[in-house]
């Protein structure tokens, strides 16, 4: 540019020749002059944005070469300048190049392949091997700068170019750049760690593993362990995987060797990148000594009727996981352990649930089913007391030789015998008859059995023909025996039991 | 002329630190995205360090990470290296890398000499 | 990481004849834009590594025609048309698609 002097006023130098631009020939003789009493040097910029400099006011480069094309600037003492763009054409070296090619995702990036000679055509861009340009790919050409890339895509990333121009008819390419692509981050890295809580004997080895992904390698993690301040760990094991041009991955694997009570806390995965931050936390907890808890069972009385299935079903923790687990019917073992199962899918889980299922009972199978579980440092135990519901049975109906009518009946919960008389002409017994004597009989051993009940009536009481009932009932059900009684004058001829 | 220059090696016990320089000359080192790369007594090449020409990205071999830090000064042209907690393995001869447009390495320092031991 | 994989380790090589070193890949290293990111360096005694191949099958600035690197996807191969006495030292191969990893060298020798 050159000056346009005011009166008064400093004015910038002139340069000779008096033109914005000139082209040289390479080999020819680069001849500039700076015009201005108070000048002070020439600068030249290269196209690599180098400066050179020369305190003389004649810059003059014999044979010049392509490399010379650039920007020369004089100055003087009052700060002013005046510039010349000088193109050095060449034709054996049309474009200026070899810087590697750098851009950052939704920014412009530029192509440093300016031009020697700018009298050519169609300055452009193409991809190396003569394939398409990405369609969504625009460029902007500046024969003094290169070419500038619009709003670079991470799909550009490692895109091979060349710049490209006609000269007298004839495509001229550059050397290739690849693009690398530097991917804005428009999100926070994402971390995770398999399991958020541990238990742990003390002497264990505690291991986790954290793992950080995110577009650049220059995502940042750590892992912290809050008590309560963020301390830093150093003794972190680190592994990282490109899974892709902008998929990284990295894992950061915290271990404890042999842990102690008070290594008992929160520890924090935590990374962050230009976008902000993201953490994940996982507790640790180290105990003295391993243990069982089981579960308090809301009812150890379980209550079933002949016949149906029942499930005895206990819930525990355990640390070390537990190692025998059975089932003992009456203080003898039982060939059935029960199912047993991991409460959560958690790793790290230290809940169990074991079930033991007990199908089609019998009367004779109430008793005291106990679950023993243990580990290498505790047990524990629970008791379900089972009493199987049974309907009444009718056992004996009988006269006595006193005169006695019996009726013994057994079943659980303890039947209650009720008697009936009916003549003959009813259909059903309804009229009560009190029992001369109810007694119960324990005849089980084990306190689960049936319950046996015998209850007698006088049968001197009767006075006409008729029926009498036996009925024996529980919450199950109902049994009956009936005596016939049959009169000849004042003796009862025939007495005859039946159910 | 174009060329690396690497200083700062030395014999250093365990757990301490060091620096490494690279000089860079005869090129337009901020434009050049750098690397370090080492190499054990009597084994291969082992890559450990990239930065990229503007500092913004950088990224480590997983065995380094946390302990060493690679950074650059383009006014001065010059890369560095700083390594903390040392370790017997990291003994070795550690040379600065220039990556070109292939993301090749096509300009290397002559090396300097890392030596950990107690 | 990807693995690198050289072969042979050790290469008696008589002067004036060829020589061909291996390289495999744990995965492929074709980028989607065409290019394979594998390099080949000589390290000869007491110097530094110099690039003799870029991206699979380029020859470096400087380097003899009488070095070739051809291959693709996960197998390459360093071909040496005519081993001079100045060739002896140690070749890398090394993959620069992901995180860099270089093969563990071979070893280049005259008979």
């Known amino acids: 540019s050159q000056p346009s002097a005011s009166p008064g006023e400093p004015s910038p130098p002139s340069i000779h020749p008096a033109q914005s631009e000139l082209i040289v020939e390479a080999g020819d003789t680069l001849s500039l002059t700076c015009i201005d009493p108070d000048f002070v040097r020439w600068t030249f910029k290269t196209y690599f944005n180098e400066m050179v400099e020369n305190k003389k006011n004649e810059w003059i480069q014999e044979k010049a070469e392509a490399t010379r094309t650039g920007t020369y600037t004089c100055s003087n003492s009052n700060g002013l300048t005046s510039s010349i763009y000088v193109f050095v054409r060449d034709p054996a070296k049309l474009f200026l190049v070899g810087l590697p090619l750098f851009g950052k995702e939704d920014s412009d990036a530029l192509v440093r392949c300016p031009l020697t000679d700018p009298q050519v055509s169609n300055y452009s861009l193409i991809e190396c091997d003569g394939k398409s340009l990405p369609t969504d790919l625009t460029f902007v050409p500046n024969p003094k700068a290169g070419i500038t890339i619009k709003n670079v895509k991470r799909a550009y990333h490692r895109l091979c170019v060349r710049c490209a121009a006609q000269r007298d008819g004839t495509w001229l390419h550059s050397d290739k750049f690849t693009l690398k692509v530097r991917a804005a981050i428009k999100a926070i890295p994402v971390v995770s760690v398999p399991e958020t809580s541990h238990l742990l004997k003390k002497g264990d080895t505690f291991t986790v593993v954290c793992t950080i992904k995110d577009v650049s390698t220059s995502v940042n993690s750590m892992w912290l362990k809050m008590n309560p301040q963020p301390q830093h760990i150093a003794q972190v094991k680190h592994n990282s995987w490109h899974r892709g041009d902008f998929n990284y991955e990295r894992q950061e694997t915290l271990t404890i060797s042999s842990a102690r009570v008070d290594d008992s806390g929160v520890f924090m995965c935590y990374a962050n990148n230009t976008f902000g931050s993201a953490n994940v936390t996982t507790t640790l907890k180290v105990v003295e000594k391993g243990f069982i808890n089981i579960s308090p069972v809301k009812n150890t009385t379980v209550f079933v009727t002949d016949g149906e299935n029942v499930d005895l079903v206990v819930e525990y923790e355990a640390y070390p996981k537990p190692e025998h687990q059975q089932w003992i019917y009456m203080n003898r073992t039982s060939a059935n352990k029960g199912k047993d199962y991991v409460k959560s899918d958690n790793k790290s889980n230290i809940r169990y649930v074991n079930q033991l299922r007990l199908t089609r009972l019998k009367g004779t199978e109430g008793g005291t089913y106990t679950f023993l579980v243990s580990n290498s440092d505790a047990s524990a135990s629970v008791t379900f007391n089972v009493y199987v519901n049974t309907k009444p049975e009718i056992l004996t109906y009988d006269r006595l030789i006193n005169g006695m009518l019996q009726c013994v009946a057994e079943g659980f919960p303890e039947p209650t015998i009720d008697w009936y008389f009916c003549t003959g002409a009813e259909q059903r017994c309804t009229t009560p008859v009190s029992p001369v004597d109810v007694q119960v009989q324990n005849v089980s051993v084990s306190p689960f059995g049936k319950l046996v009940v015998q209850s007698s009536i006088d049968s001197s009481v009767f006075r006409h023909n008729g029926t009498v009932e036996c009925k024996a009932s529980n919450d199950v059900g109902k049994s009956s025996a009936f005596f016939n009684f049959a009169f000849k004058g004042n003796n009862k001829e025939q007495i005859q039991a039946h159910t | 002329q174009v060329q690396l220059v690497e200083s700062g090696g030395g014999v250093v016990q365990p757990g301490r630190s060091l620096r490494l320089s690279c000089a860079a000359s005869g090129f337009t080192f901020s434009r050049y995205g750098m690397h370090w790369v080492r190499q054990a007594p009597g084994k291969g090449l082992e890559w450990v360090a990239v930065?990229?020409?503007?500092?913004?990205?950088?990224d480590y071999t997983d065995s380094v990470r946390g302990r060493f830090t690679i950074s650059r000064d383009n006014s001065k042209n010059t890369l560095y290296l700083q390594m903390n907690s040392l370790r017997a393995e990291d003994t070795a001869v550690y040379y600065c890398?220039?990556?070109?447009?292939?993301?090749?390495?096509?300009?290397w320092g002559q090396g300097t000499t890392v030596t950990v031991s107690s | 990481d990807i693995v690198m994989t050289q072969s042979p380790l050790s290469l008696p090589v008589t002067p004036g004849e060829p020589a061909s070193i291996s390289c495999r890949s744990s995965?492929?290293?074709?980028?989607?834009?065409?290019?394979?990111?594998l390099d080949w360096y000589l390290q000869k005694p007491g110097q530094s590594p110099q690039l003799l191949i870029y991206l699979g099958s380029n020859r470096a600035s400087g380097v003899p025609d009488r070095f070739s690197g051809s291959g693709s996807g996960t197998d390459f191969t360093l071909k040496i048309s005519r081993v001079e006495a100045e060739d002896v030292g140690v070749y890398y191969c090394m993959q620069a698609l992901q995180t860099i990893t270089f093969g563990q060298g071979t070893r280049l020798e005259i008979k």
């Open positions: 890398a220039r990556e070109d447009w292939a993301e090749a390495f096509d300009m």
């Open positions: 995965q492929s290293l074709l980028h989607s834009n065409g290019y394979n990111y």
């Open positions: 930065i990229w020409y503007d500092g913004t990205n950088k």
